[in-house]
């Protein structure tokens, strides 16, 4: 297993619709053809997997049908979008990149993107 540098923004504020997008960029030391991207969430010292996708270079990222993540790839960059976020989902989202094929296997883990999610203010009751 060889180490690889992964860069991602330090902080992002999700949209009022609970959508956050950020780029995860990795310094590929070679010509990988198969890449696996995993998003991990760290909050309260707990780390959980949010979503993961394996893709062939030049192809679309394919997440599971029920995943809250979508993404596109371009060269050594992966543009990740996480949807359906609520205030309780605020936390550090870490991008993990694995170059699966061909060997050697490379692993890179970013420093994380702090995603803040602000629940929209409830609309005041209105009389009609």
């Amino acid at each position: 297993c060889k180490a690889m540098h992964v860069a991602q923004p330090a902080v992002v504020l999700a949209s009022s619709r609970g959508i956050a997008s950020f780029v995860c960029e990795y310094a590929s030391p070679g010509k990988a053809t198969e890449v696996r991207v995993t998003v991990l969430r760290q909050a309260d010292s707990q780390v959980t997997e949010v979503c993961a996708a394996t893709y062939m270079m030049g192809n679309e990222l394919t997440f599971l049908d029920d995943s809250i993540c979508t993404g596109t790839s371009s060269g050594n960059q992966v543009n990740l979008t996480i949807q359906g976020l609520r205030a309780m989902d605020t936390g550090l989202y870490i991008c993990k990149v694995e170059l699966m094929y061909p060997p050697p296997y490379y692993l890179g883990i970013g420093n994380g993107t702090q995603i803040y999610v602000i629940d929209p203010e409830p609309c005041p009751d209105s009389d009609f």
Partner: antibody, heavy 116, light 108 residues
Framework: QVQLVQSGAEVKKPGASVKVSCKAS????????ISWVRQAPGQGLEWMGW????????NYAQKLQGRVTMTTDTSTSTAYMELRSLRSDDTAVYYC?????????WGQGTLVTVSS | EIVLTQSPATLSLSPGERATLSCGAS???????LAWYQQKPGLAPRLLIY???SRATGIPDRFSGSGSGTDFTLTITRLEPEDFAVYYC?????????FGQGTKVEIK
């Protein structure tokens, strides 16, 4: 090294607007947020809101909603805070700061005086 | 909004003594998103602690933070002459983010 340099002191009349700038250097501007905090003379710190320089999304303090606008110009690594319909109780030192989880780097502050 | 109440308002101590500053929240602060700042007259605040207990870059280890939920503490183990200042806590776990009213640590 990381630096945040704010625009100079302003004197405004009640009802006017003020726009304070905050020029960042020494880091990747779009990777961080910019938070705005103000401090009235002899008083404590008041959070005004923040902007994500990555995507331009903003989160404002409820009491300033409708009067404040925070923006960024990523081409010049500069953040702006505009406050409208100024009142005498808006007289304060306005600070910008680089935000992630706390403000680790601060601007020097901009004194805004609202007086007729 | 979450109201932060700092106590005491003023703490009179001598250099070398231990300072314990409290910050109480009106509601639980999620993920321990609480920071402490130091401010001296005429200067911008300085971040000491973030995420309740993580020291910011360059902060000496005599400063430590602890707590969870609604009760948080900043401890200065041995006060140095440069530590006499006003200290603020800030929560950023729930919008709007808020500051406490401050605790002044003065020389006895």
């Amino acid at each position: 090294q990381v630096q945040l340099v704010q625009s100079g002191a302003e004197v405004k009349k009640p009802g006017a607007s003020v726009k304070v700038s905050c020029k960042a250097s020494g880091y990747t501007f779009t990777s961080y947020g910019i938070s705005w905090v103000r401090q009235a003379p002899g008083q404590g710190l008041e959070w005004m809101g923040w902007i994500s320089a990555y995507n331009g999304n903003t989160n404002y303090a409820q009491k300033l909603q409708g009067r404040v606008t925070m923006t960024t110009d990523t081409s010049t690594s500069t953040a702006y805070m505009e406050l409208r319909s100024l009142r005498s109780d808006d007289t304060a030192v306005y600070y910008c700061g680089r935000w992630v989880r706390g403000v680790e780097y601060w601007g020097q502050g901009t004194l805004v005086t609202v007086s007729s | 909004e979450i109201v932060l109440t700092q106590s005491p308002a003023t703490l009179s101590l001598s250099p070398g003594e231990r300072a314990t500053l409290s910050c109480g929240a009106s509601q639980s602060v999620s993920s321990s998103y609480l920071a402490w700042y130091q401010q001296k007259p005429g200067l911008a605040p300085r971040l000491l602690i973030y995420d309740t207990s993580s020291r910011a870059t360059g902060i000496p280890d005599r400063f430590s933070g602890s707590g969870s939920g609604t009760d948080f503490t900043l401890t200065i183990t041995r006060l140095e002459p440069e530590d006499f200042a006003v200290y603020y806590c800030q929560q950023y776990g729930r919008s709007p983010w808020t500051f406490g009213q401050g605790t002044k640590v003065e020389i006895k």
